[in-house]
């Protein structure tokens, strides 16, 4: 039979510049002598010879003189290969091929890695910054391998994904320099963190920059928004109200108005230096241009979707700045429930039946209540499931399992907690013979 050759299943991870051992072993038979051994290490893909041992002698390295065996351990079945001063180009699969009377082989993977340097951060522009200004923050980390994953977040740890451009360039040694650029509109102040992750080493290198824009001696702009969430039905238009008090002589040329998503800082809509810069949010937003000069900075959001739900910040900068956040609560009414009864014929008192109440395309998740004909809640043996479709709207299915009495009415009420809208359906099951569906 074939000779059994053993190598590690997992890749061997080696840092650039260090030495790595590619383990390989076989089980020598009693009376085995090295004169019988043929050992070949080669690159799996190209079959390029790396190192060999034949006719009782180490034939040496065929791989830039950077490989060595463990001669004192060969007789015990240790055919491991030492690779010195590991380079990026060494990454890949190496085959250990052992022949005595029979032969066997196995491949071991070498994964090369190099840690990334602590990122350096640059801010452009880096002086005379005002709220509403757009700044470019560059995060640079050097000499890592393999390619990095880069993450940006604000001071609260919220990921910043919009307007990020990351480039990675390999140098002559194959090591990567990573440059990630975040373009962001400044708020009152903010901390921006960049995390560079080496996916092999699971090593994180991070840096942050805190930007405090210039304040005006004349004081902040007072920005007013409604305290309560704005409730909008899916598919309709919503107005997120925001207002400020313009001073005498105020002109729109002085105004920086920015609407952004509170959590991610994603730009939604802006007005700067006398011009509506338009929607940055799927072209579904609009200002009220004729009302801006009077201090009305409200935002119209068209064809509301479930995904729009959340907090929007209205940011107003004139000489100084102010901001306030308004919450959008999206809602959709649930359809009148449809009721199904199983089984639905030849029913007798004492039978167990399953009544399913289904209501569709509502938002947010519903509350479901069951009751009997006397209005007494039925809570036992109820299973309710809610599934969101692609638009984020929920279909609700509630199943009541009940033992039939002589007759009875069973009602299902589906409540939308935001709209305080109740949709209900009922089924009445009466004596013999029973057929379904009876008219409720």
């Amino acid at each position: 039979g074939a000779l059994e050759v053993q190598v590690p299943e997992d890749p061997v991870v080696a840092l650039v510049g260090t030495d790595a051992t590619l383990c390989c072993s076989f089980s020598p038979e009693p009376g085995f002598s090295l004169a019988q051994l043929n050992l070949i290490w080669q690159l799996t893909d190209t079959k390029q010879l790396v190192h060999s041992f034949a006719e009782g002698q180490d034939q040496g390295s065929a791989y830039a003189n950077r490989t060595a065996l463990f001669p004192d351990l060969l007789a015990q079945g240790n055919a491991s290969l030492r690779l010195q001063r590991v380079r990026v180009a060494d990454e890949g699969s190496f085959t250990c091929f052992v022949s005595i009377r029979d032969f066997g082989s196995a491949a071991v993977s070498l994964q090369v890695a190099a840690p990334y340097s602590k990122p350096s951060m640059t801010l452009e522009p880096n002086k005379d910054l005002r709220p509403g200004d757009t700044v470019t923050i560059t995060c640079s980390s050097y000499q890592g391998y393999p390619e990095a994953e880069v993450f940006w977040q604000d001071g609260q740890g919220v990921p910043l994904t919009g307007n990020v451009t990351t480039s990675q360039m390999a140098n002559e040694q194959g090591l990567f320099d990573v440059h990630s650029i975040l373009r962001v509109v400044l708020g009152a102040n903010g901390t921006y963190s960049c995390l560079v992750r080496n996916p092999v080493l699971q090593q994180d290198a991070h840096s942050s920059v805190t930007i405090t824009p210039q304040r005006s001696p004349t004081g902040a702009v007072e920005v007013q928004v409604p305290e309560d969430p704005v409730v909008a039905l899916v598919g309709t238009d919503a107005t997120l109200r925001c207002s400020f008090s313009p001073e005498p002589g105020f002109s729109l040329a002085q105004l920086n108005l920015i609407w952004q998503l509170t959590d991610t800082k994603q730009l939604v809509h802006s007005f700067t230096e006398g011009r509506d810069q338009g929607s940055a949010y799927a072209n579904r937003t609009a200002l009220f241009p004729d009302l801006l000069a009077q201090g009305n900075a409200s935002l119209r959001l068209q064809r509301v979707r479930v995904a729009d739900e959340g907090s929007f910040t209205c940011f107003v900068s004139i000489r100084d700045f102010g901001s306030a956040a308004v919450s959008l609560q999206v809602a959709a009414p649930y359809s009148k429930p449809s009721m199904t009864l199983e089984p639905n014929k030849d029913l007798r008192p004492g039978d167990t039946v399953t009544i399913t109440c289904s209501s569709y395309r509502g938002y947010p998740e519903a509350e479901v209540f069951w009751q009997d004909g006397q209005g007494v809640p039925l809570t036992g043996n109820v299973t309710t499931s809610q599934m969101a479709n692609e638009q984020g709207l929920f279909d609700v299915h509630s199943v009541l399992r009940v033992v039939l009495g002589a007759n009875g009415t069973y009602s299902c009420l589906v409540r939308n907690p935001v709209l305080q809208q109740d949709a209900h359906g009922s089924v009445t099951i009466t004596g013999q013979p029973m057929t379904f569906p009876p008219e409720a």
Partner: antibody, heavy 116, light 107 residues
Framework: EVQLVQSGAEVKKPGSSVKVSCKAS????????MNWVKQRPGQGLEWIGR????????RYNQNFRDKARLTVDKSSSTAYMELSSLRSEDTAVYYC?????????WGQGTTVTVSS | DIQMTQSPSSLSASVGDRVTITCRTS??????LAWYQQKPGKSPKLLIY???TLEEGVPSRFRGSGSGTHFTLTISSLQPEDFATYFC?????????FGGGTKVEIK
Amino acid sequence: EVQLVQSGAEVKKPGSSVKVSCKASGYTFTAYWMNWVKQRPGQGLEWIGRIDPYDSETRYNQNFRDKARLTVDKSSSTAYMELSSLRSEDTAVYYCARGVRIFDYWGQGTTVTVSS
Amino acid sequence: DIQMTQSPSSLSASVGDRVTITCRTSENIDYTLAWYQQKPGKSPKLLIYNANTLEEGVPSRFRGSGSGTHFTLTISSLQPEDFATYFCKQAYDVPRTFGGGTKVEIK
């Protein structure tokens, strides 16, 4: 080191056009607006307009709206100003300068002479 | 447009003199004013922004003050390299506008 290098002097006939370039280096080109400023011989400074290299959004001084057209080529980090329908009063030194409110770096200037 | 009135249009002074240049604006521009120095045949150079913030590398003998509509540039002790033309510029509104300039000459 931040540098703005402008194209060389131009002599043009009345009615013709000229395109002045400003090549930026030493900073992230898309991070700063590029402004253009006119200075007639022995006179003060006039702001022509500016362009955001990131998305090519422009703002013009109304006095130059029909005279100047600002563009950028992000791949070469170069800003351009084209002056059309040249007249003798367009004879001036034209500067590019980076920044939004403060112009912290300026090109060396390009002299445009309009003469028949 | 915001009008910028700079005075004097020119002045003669000696090395070591204290020099003051003023700039008035047609409307309140808060503190968004910058001062530039220009020497013959050269580009303007930023000296001061936000009315009183000295640009990096600019000698501390240059000082800016004021807010609203009235601003001053003071050179505490004039040096030979300071003989040049000085411009103020407002950054409150678009279009950006410059003062007419003050030429500082050797007496």
